[in-house]
Amino acid sequence: MASMGLQVMGIALAVLGWLAVMLCCALPMWRVTAFIGSNIVTSQTIWEGLWMNCVVQSTGQMQCKVYDSLLALPQDLQAARALVIISIIVAALGVLLSVVGGKCTNCLEDESAKAKTMIVAGVVFLLAGLMVIVPVSWTAHNIIQDFYNPLVASGQKREMGASLYVGWAASGLLLLGGGLLCCNCPPRTDKPYSAKYSAARSAAASNYV
């Protein structure tokens, strides 16, 4: 069976990944546009997130506006919102399973069941990681594609926001944590009976000598 240290490390990384997904979801910085006028006074930055967009003036003043409806959100960000929310829920399930299957918890008595629960938790974290990496990479792909597309006017070109980097980090942590938990092999069952039973049987047999 994998060492407790490896298991704790896997859970810790996955939990960090889960928290990072929440941050990625909440930050309004999926797509960033920096408009620089001929003088610094006219410069402003527009941040677009899954829930709102914010305009930051060069003075430091920031105004955020929550999207009026789901239709106000571009299609790629609509899909990203759905996948990220599902990822958070799936990762939460992974956290729950890893607590149940943890070596240092007593939710399950059977070591084999604990190990299997841990493997399932690992798979769940891997799924959560994939659910984050897909929308984040897709959004980044669209941004890069539009940046080099001559049919996209200057004012419609975007840059990658901090949320995308947080998302990649989150997926990396979830995949790494999930991978470590999947290394948690169930105990080998080579012996047909336990040592306790074997000792008891030999003691009983000696009475008949």
Epitope: F35, G37, N149, L151, A153, S154, G155, Q156
Partner: antibody, heavy 120, light 107 residues
Framework: EVQLQQSGPELVKPGASVKISCKTS????????RHWVKQSRGKSLEWIGT????????RYNQKFKGKATLTVDKSSSTAYMELRSLTSEDSAVYYC?????????????WGQGTSITVSS | DIQMTQSSSSFSVSLGDRVTITCKAS??????LAWYQQKPGNAPRLLIS???SLEAGVPSGFSGSGSGKDYTLSITSLQTEDVATYYC?????????FGGGTKLELK
């Protein structure tokens, strides 16, 4: 020298369609996007749409969606615009233009224009 | 769509005059502005792009200035060949839009 040579004037009946061409020379055809602009008599200029000669990708002004269709033929370095269901409102001079390399929605070279008259 | 407004549709001018044509955008266009000159029966000709950059072959008497929403085309000393209609165009966002034009007419 960069040149955009457009097809000649057209007199068409209402409800008909017309396809005008714009042959380019003097530069690599696929390097710059191609725009089409409408100018009604005595009026200002209106952007119809644009096409990327590299891959045929198009963008249209909402006003001209369903009215204009832009295509290119890379082999002959020619861009085409088809206008359908013509009405008197479509009588105008139509220009094909080349997008500026670094600012593609600016237009550095213009064809001589093709006059379309819609009349029964 | 961004609206481009050229306040004067026509201007009576004399040769040698300094002429200033203004163009106002409905929102900030971050210097993505072009000026065109059109003479009767001809296609427009690009004079200035990026609000201030003079195109090759354009006389140095032409200049562009402005930022944000307000832009100006200036002709230092009007010549006969400068009598034409001038259009501004924003290319900050799609659809690109043109001003209504300013026609220069000799007094």
């Amino acid at each position: 020298e960069v040149q955009l040579q457009q097809s000649g004037p057209e007199l068409v009946k209402p409800g008909a369609s017309v396809k005008i061409s714009c042959k380019t020379s003097g530069y690599t055809f696929t390097e710059n996007i191609r725009h089409w602009v409408k100018q009604s008599r005595g009026k200002s200029l209106e952007w119809i749409g644009t096409i990327n000669p590299n891959n045929g990708e198009t963008r249209y002004n909402q006003k001209f969606k369903g009215k204009a269709t832009l295509t290119v033929d890379k082999s002959s370095s020619t861009a085409y615009m088809e206008l359908r269901s013509l009405t008197s409102e479509d009588s105008a001079v139509y220009y094909c233009t080349r997008g500026i390399t670094k600012s593609p929605y600016g237009m550095d070279y213009w064809g001589q224009g093709t006059s379309i008259t819609v009349s029964s | 769509d961004i609206q481009m407004t050229q306040s004067s549709s026509s201007f009576s001018v004399s040769l040698g005059d300094r002429v200033t044509i203004t163009c106002k955008a409905s929102e900030d266009i971050y210097n993505r502005l072009a000026w065109y000159q059109q003479k009767p029966g001809n296609a427009p000709r690009l004079l200035i792009s990026g609000a201030t950059s003079l195109e090759a072959g354009v006389p140095s008497g032409f200049s562009g200035s402005g930022s944000g929403k307000d832009y100006t085309l200036s002709i230092t000393s009007l010549q006969t060949e400068d009598v034409a209609t001038y259009y501004c165009q924003q290319y900050w966002s799609t659809p690109p839009t043109f001003g209504g034009g300013t026609k220069l007419e000799l007094k």
